[in-house]
Every structure is written in C-alpha cells, then in structure tokens.
Interface confidence: low
C-alpha cells in the first residue's frame, strides 16, 4: 500500500502520527501555547495523499497561528476599552458602567493562551428586572431586552465563533434564567484542566448533594457499600475506543474513569456505575442492572478488563449507539422497577461521555439524548434528574457544536468541555471532587417537598434557651458551631445552664446540647450610646456557640451555607477564584432581595431585604421612634451599615424570641445565611399567648414596622477570626 509523503512539517510546531505514514494514519499538529495549528490535522488516504478534514482547497502549508480572544460585539449600559477586533493572548479588556448601573462580573478580563477570557462576563445592571440582566458574553449578540418573568433572550455568535451553552434562555419564576450562560469561543479553543475540574466538580457536587447523602456504615474490610433506599445515582461512563484514540490514550480514559469511580464511591450516596466502551458499536462492560455495579471493586475490575482491541474490527465513532445503549439500559431498569414507582422516579442519572472526536456514523447522538430525556420525564421540575457531561479530548477533530448539543444546560453550570489531551483529562478527574470537604456536612440543603416537616425544611434552625425563660434562635453553621445574636446573652456569661435544641429525626422535640464555649462579640454593648440619647444600640450583635458535642447530621440537622466560604462557593456553583465580594454581588443583587427567617412555630416567613437607595429609605423610619431614640439627629448612629433592613410592605416582622435566627435566601435549591435577626420597631407577638398567632401592625402605626438584621458580609473579620479552622473562607 502506498505511504503518504513526509513533507508535512509545521513551522514553529510539532506533529505526531497515529499509525506512521501508512493509510489511515492521523497526523496531528501541535503548537506552543498561545499558538494554534492550522490545519489541526491531516488524514493519510488510501491513495497515499494527505487530506485535511473540512478543507476545500489543495494541501496548504501548516502553520502555527497566534491565538486570539473574541471581542465584545455589544456592551450595554457601559463602555469597554480598548476597542479591538480581537485580542492577543495576555491582552486585557476593561469594563465600566454608566451612572446608576452596578458592575457584576469581572471589571478587567485577560485573554488566556487557550483563546478563552479569564473571569466572568461583565454586566451593568440596575436590578430592575425580575431576573438579573443576563449580560452578553464576549463575541455574542443578544436579542431580547426585557427581563420579566417569562421573557426570553436569544444569543448568537459573531463571525466564525462557536456558541457553547444556551442559545435561548427564559426568565423563570424563581428569578433565575433557564439554561446556562452562552459563551462564544474560537473553534480552536480548548479548556484548561484547572478550569474544568472545579466547574465539573461543582456541578457534580450539587448533583451529589441532591442525591441525599446519608451516613452509611462501611465494612471494615474493603469498601462494600451498604445500599439504603434513599436517593440513588446511576452513573454511566462512556469511553471512546475508535481508531483515532491511541492505545495509550485509551489507557488514560480508563484511568480517569477509575479515578471518577473511586471518588464517587467515597461519597455517602447510593450509586450504580455502568461502563460502556464504543467505536462503531458499543460494548457494555458493566450494566446498572447488574448488582455488581454498586460495588466499587467490581466496577473498577470491569474497567481494568476493558480492552482496546475489543473494537479493532469497527473503528468509527458511533456516539448515537453508545448513548442508545444507555437508553436501553434505562428502559430495562424502568420496566424492572415499574414506571410509576418511587424506586424508579427517584434515581438520578449522570452520563459522562469521553470522546476524542465527532460521531461519524450511526445518526445524530442528539436523537438518543432526546429519547433519554423522554424516558426520564425531564422537565423544569425534574431537570436535576439528568446530567450529561460531554468531554472532548484533543483539539483536532472534536466538534464543539455536537458536544454542546449533548451536554446538559443548567444555570451556572457547564457540562461540555474540550481538553487539549488525555493528560489534561487525567488532571481534571483527579481534582474535580475533593470529597473530604463535601461528605456529610454538605451545607444549605433543606427538604423542599410539600410533606416535609418545618425542621426538615430548615434543618440548620436551632433554639437557644438561656437561664431566663426568653429564648433565642440560631443557626448551625457546622456540625459543632451555632451562629446567633449577642444580645441573647447580656445577663452575664455563665452559660453552664444554657441549652441548645437541635433538630433530631427521632424526636419531634429535638435534642438538647450543652455549650462548651460562647464567643460573644466584644464590640456589643447595648448601652454604648446612652449618653447620646440612644437607649439601646445593637452594633456587633453577633455571637458564636461551640456545642459540647458534634451534631450528627441528618434530615433534621444540617448546617446552612455561610457566604464567603468554599462550601457556599460550591453550592452557588461559582468558579474557583471567586471572592467574598462576588458572593455579596450574587446574593444581594437587587434593591429588594426576597429572604426568609424562621418563626417561633418553626414555619418559614418571608421578608424583603432593602439594598442601595431602598436601604436608606427603609432605615430612615427609625427617626420617628421617639421612645427608644428621643433626640436622634442622625439615623446612621443607630442603623449602621452592619445592618440589613426589612419590614416594608407585606413583610413579616420577627418576634422578640426569634432574635439570633438566620436571615437566609435560596439560590439554586440551596440556602445561604446573609444575616441574623437582631432588633426591630415592632413585636408582632406582643400580648399573644399563642406562638402560632402574630398580629400585623395597623397600617396607621407610627413609626411603621422595621426590622434590622446583622449583615454577615460586614462581620467577615470577626467570623474569620473565630471560624478560620472550621470553615474554608474565600478571599475578601
């Protein structure tokens, strides 16, 4: 057979050959970082001639071209500099907002050597819509300028850029855009492992958090997992074994999959793993219908037995058939368990596709995905029951559009990635799940089902009983620490008689814990400003209690997420380099932020936290309170910027015994504490013997109700000082 000519050098780069100079061999070019090969590859045809995939004209000289990042096409409500057609590696673009708009995202972004911008999309927002302004990523054009409930925006990419993410997004009732942020990227761009690992890990962690991570006993020998009937995860690993994957690369696919299996089994969840290798046809090495799929050693052993030569007779890439075999597996399991049963409906499914190219036979893989979505009844309510991760490896023949089509689209998450090579893939799987930080004490998970008890809905909520009858509330922020208000403890510091009542699944009364240590903010002094005619002052109204024993995590007892921590960062599904300020911008992102606190009877009540201009008018009312503040000249003497303000319009007001409880909000089905109940101008429980009855203030009341909550974003130094070795804090 003829061999292909050897005059294929690339100026400034190198090349590799999959099968020497023989027909069928794939020549892959590579360039130093910051440059990309054009063309990326050539194929040796049976005629002994090189063919460049997708090329229309004859063989052109291969060159290394400089990588460039796409320019903004439009930037609303602000300006960007410098204005270039595209940007070189290392080049910066800066964003500024017009007056009245606040910048969300990165004010300066740098073009990275993979043709991707660092940081996050800059958006100039005024918080006016039901959903935040979704922004326009660099290189994209957006149509649709209304951000109300039900409004849609559409995106397309300029010139030859490829869109990944959602081309259409809808503003949902919960104030969050459907789908995932669209990104326009160069066809030759790829992802760095250090970006993919946290993105993949964050998404996966969220899924694992949703899969009911209950504590299970492990046998002392081996790692046999005791399966319980709570949540269950089916993980399907699809490994490309087509001709263009070298044997060495296939080994790394296997190793990476083994790492994934090892990590997933160390989460306290029930999991079954399927292993499928594919080329022209799929080969099922382990099915979720096999009991062994729940045993880590069996799964890893079936992976190790996966043989590169299994597919030597059919060397195409039939991604459709591989995904269809997952569909058939699901179909069989559904028939086995019964379509209507909880056992079937409560299984979450995650598919990880590892491929080095685009499918070239067997029809569109999208069809198989549609079948899978159909059988799992994936809709807005059940969106969390399926995650498809499409990971392309090796830049040469990977089709961004196809990967993007296959990957799931979820707000704040990415499911489609292209990595430069299998080594990068290995790094990703090694770092994506840092299990030690996530198991068991995963934060901010509340049961949102209609039949859940109040304590299951807010499992962080605790009651504090000091010596006097009057109680306070607090929130678990770890398995041994409670955050509450300092004013609860103003009658002396002997806490030997205090008790903290924590939720317990075995008792509707909860479980009582003694306190090992109380840390009360030294800055708190209710009489600090008495000389100024301010009879009570609640600055620094914050305290921490260390319980005498660790709380056993359960459906009734689990910490809430504290912003500015790595734990909260995972729950928010934010990138790894996020800061405390990013969390504040994301959580307190409107002039009126819907939030909650827990009432004496355990129910969740609604408030609106006022920000910006609205905070000023919310706080202003204090000047009308002549009893507590007889000769107040400056409201800020009482309401410092340590406080969040609520109590306007239809807000509920906290009662006296609810002090210290968490003021929290929900994002992405997780809960985050942004404040704690401190003081207010009206007590709705006053004169009421029944803890279930609250009296609304008469509309004519002067002053009208207002409630003030310690803002945890303003207490960071103190929190870090005392919780530095309990929680992992992000940079400010």
């Amino acid at each position: 057979a003829p061999s292909c000519p050897q005059n294929v050098n690339i100026s400034g780069g190198t090349f590799t050959l999959s099968h020497g100079w023989a027909p069928g061999s794939l020549l892959t070019y590579s360039c130093p970082q910051g440059l990309y090969p054009s063309p990326a590859s050539r194929l040796c045809k049976s005629s002994g001639q090189w063919q460049t995939p997708g090329a229309t004209r004859s063989l052109s000289k291969a060159v290394c071209k400089p990588v460039r990042c796409p320019a903004p096409v439009s930037f609303e409500n602000g300006i960007y500099t410098p204005r270039l057609g595209s940007y070189p590696v290392g080049g910066n673009v800066s964003f500024e907002c017009e007056d009245g708009f606040i910048l969300r995202g990165s004010p300066v972004r740098q073009c990275r050597p993979n043709g991707m911008w660092d940081g996050e999309t800059a958006v100039c927002d005024n918080g006016a819509g039901h959903c935040p302004n979704p922004g326009i990523s660099l290189g994209a054009v957006r149509t649709g300028f209304r951000f109300g409930h039900g409004d849609k925006v559409r995106y397309r990419c300029s010139s030859n850029l490829v869109l990944t993410g959602s081309s259409e997004r809808e503003c949902q009732g919960n104030g969050v855009w459907s789908g995932t942020e669209p990104i326009c990227r160069q066809p030759y761009s790829y992802d760095f492992p250090e970006d993919v690992a946290p993105a993949l890990g964050t998404s996966f962690s969220h899924m694992l958090g949703a899969t009911n991570p209950t504590q299970k006993t492990k046998e002392s020998l081996g790692r046999k997992i005791q399966i319980q009937r709570s949540g269950h995860l089916n993980l399907y690993l699809l490994l490309d074994c087509s001709q263009s994957v070298s044997e060495n690369d296939f080994l790394i696919f296997k190793e990476s999959a083994s790492l994934m299996v090892d990590r997933i089994f160390s989460f306290e969840i029930n999991v079954s793993v399927a292993i499928i290798t594919f080329a022209s046809e799929p080969k099922v090495l382990m099915s979720v219908l096999n009991d062994n799929s729940r045993d880590m050693t069996e799964v890893i052993s079936s992976l190790e037995n996966a043989n590169y030569k299994d597919h030597e007779n059919g060397t195409g890439t039939n991604t459709y058939a591989a995904l269809n075999s997952v569909y058939l597996m699901m179909n069989n399991q559904m028939r086995l368990l019964g379509m209507e049963t909880m056992a079937w409906q409560e299984i979450r499914h995650a598919i990880i596709l590892l491929t080095d190219g685009k499918s070239n036979m067997g029809g569109s893989p999208k069809t198989a995905v549609d079948h899978i979505r159909e059988i799992l009844n994936i809709n807005q309510k059940r969106n969390d029951y399926l995650d498809i991760y499409a990971i392309g490896v090796g830049k040469l023949d990977v089709d961004w559009r196809e990967l993007n089509e296959l990957g799931s689209k979820k707000d704040g998450e990415r499911h489609a990635f292209i990595l430069q090579d299998t080594k990068a893939l290995h790094q990703v799987f090694e770092h994506m799940l840092d299990v030690s930080k996530l198991t068991d004490t995963i934060c901010g998970v509340g049961n949102m089902s209609a039949n859940a008890s109040d304590q299951e809905r807010t499992p962080w909520h605790v009651t504090i009983k000091p010596k006097s009858q009057e109680t306070c509330r607090g929130a678990l922020i770890s398995d041994q620490w409670v955050l509450t208000a300092a004013h609860c403890f103003r009658d002396g510091n002997d806490h030997s008689l205090w008790r903290v009542n924590v939720g317990d699944p075995k008792s509707q009364w909860g479980k009582e814990f003694l306190i090992e240590k109380a840390v009360i903010s030294p800055g708190f002094d209710v009489f600090a400003k008495k000389n100024q005619g301010i009879l009570e002052f609640y600055g620094d109204d914050i305290a921490l209690l260390k319980l005498a024993q660790k709380v056993k995590m359960s459906t009734h007892a689990r910490p809430i997420c504290l912003p500015c921590t790595m734990e909260a960062n995972l729950a928010l599904r934010r990138p790894q380099g996020s800061t405390c300020r990013d969390h504040e911008n994301e959580l307190l992102n409107k002039q009126s932020v819907p939030a909650h606190f827990v009432a004496l009877n355990g129910s969740k009540l609604n408030i609106n936290l006022k920000m910006g201009v609205e905070w000023t008018s919310c706080a202003e009312v204090v000047s009308q309170e002549k009893t507590m503040f007889p000769n107040l000249t400056d409201v800020r003497e009482v309401v410092t910027d340590q406080f969040l303000c609520s109590g306007t319009q239809e807000d509920e007001s906290p009662c006296k015994g609810e002090s210290g409880g968490a003021v929290f909000l929900e994002r992405r089905f997780r809960f985050f504490q942004v404040g704690l109940v401190s003081w207010g101008l009206y007590n709705p429980c006053l004169g009421s013997a029944d803890k279930n009855s609250r009296k609304r203030a008469p509309r004519s009341k002067v002053p009208p109700p207002r409630d003030f909550h310690i803002n945890l974003f303003r207490m960071q130094p103190w929190l870090r000082q005392h919780l530095g070795d309990v929680l992992n804090f992000l940079p400010l």
Partner: antibody, heavy 119, light 107 residues
Amino acid sequence: QVQLVQSGAEVKKPGASVKVSCKASGYSFTTYYMYWVRQAPGQGLEWMGIITPSGGSTTYAQKFQDRVTMTRDASTTTVYMELSSLRSEDTAVYYCARGYEGSYGFDHWGQGTLVTVSS
Amino acid sequence: SYELTQPPSVSLSPGQTASITCSGDKLGNKYTCWYQQKPGQSPVLVIYQDNKRPSGIPERFSGSNSGNTATLTISGTQAMDEADYYCQTWDSSTAVFGGGTKLTVLG
C-alpha cells in the same frame, strides 16, 4: 528570530541591590511570560519567579519573596529583576527565560548575567 | 515543598542509549520538561510536556513520564550530547528543577 539580551556582569557588596535587565525582540512581547532563573557556580538551576509582560503581574518563589522585584517596560519590551539585601550566596549567573506558565517549558533563554557579591 | 531527584551522573559509550531519570511524588500527574546545558552556555529546552520535542531538537531525544518517574532517553548518544540535563515541573504556581545529571560520553 527570538532574542533575549541581558545586561552585563555586576560586582556588588553585601547588603546592596542589583538590577538586571532583559531585552526581548523577535516575537510578540505580551504573548509570552518571562521567568528568572539563577545558577550558582557549579550548582543547579533555581527558579526565582515569573512576570506577565502584558499586565505586569508577578509570582515569586517563596525563597525570594521578600527580596526580589520583577518589573517590565512594555514600550521597550524589557523586563527587569531587582534583588536586594545581597549576600555572598547570591553570587550566580541570572538568566531570563521566555515561555509559558505550565507545561511548555522555557523555550528561549538569555545569555545570562553574572552577579558577584563580595566585600 | 516539592522536590525532584536526579542521579548526579550517567556515563556511557557513543551509540548507546542514555536514560536519565527524574523522580518526585506523583510526578506522572504533572507535566515534565527537560533542559540540556553545556559548559558556559545557557540551558536549552529539549523536551516539553513529558514527550514533545521543540523544533530543532534531534529525534534521538525522547521523554516519558508515569507513576513517580519521568525519563529522558537519548538513543544513539553522540559526543555532542555530553552536557548537564535538568528536569523541571510545576508545583502549583512554582517551577521546580531537579538537581541535574551530568551525562558523560566516554571515549
């Protein structure tokens, strides 16, 4: 072609500072990172730090954190490395090298600048 | 801090294959580069990303990396290959060099 031309040899007294320059030419200055590596007589290579020519951001090796300052002048495509509080063990050849942060290595090196610290 | 260990010296006759090793904890999970330095000259990059050759470096230079060990192999060693060889990797944001190996081509 790519060239990194360093300033000439220096003799310094202990406690003094030295500033070595490295002029880059033949490529897009802001596309590549610049590194500084030193080599004491008869010894191995020791990495000192990195500077991003586009933005000027730096990362220094722990050992030199308090004594080294790397700067760049984009208009003259020159990077500088200043080492303060010199001691005799700082006697070495100091190299600037071009490359990427990560796996691509330092693909072009300056000719080296010998700094001798002696009282 | 992360350390890379190399043998101080390797000797062999012309035409033979030289193998220079570089070991470090889980080094196979990191990328390794190799540099050649001849007396009185600046170092030259001979291998990057474990096994890739920059243009201008002869095909007889190859690299591999797995487990805890990276290896630089020079097949058909020539007198002109006599030099010091350094391995280098990254540990978080810090570049780490091995202590260097002196390759002597006898005769």
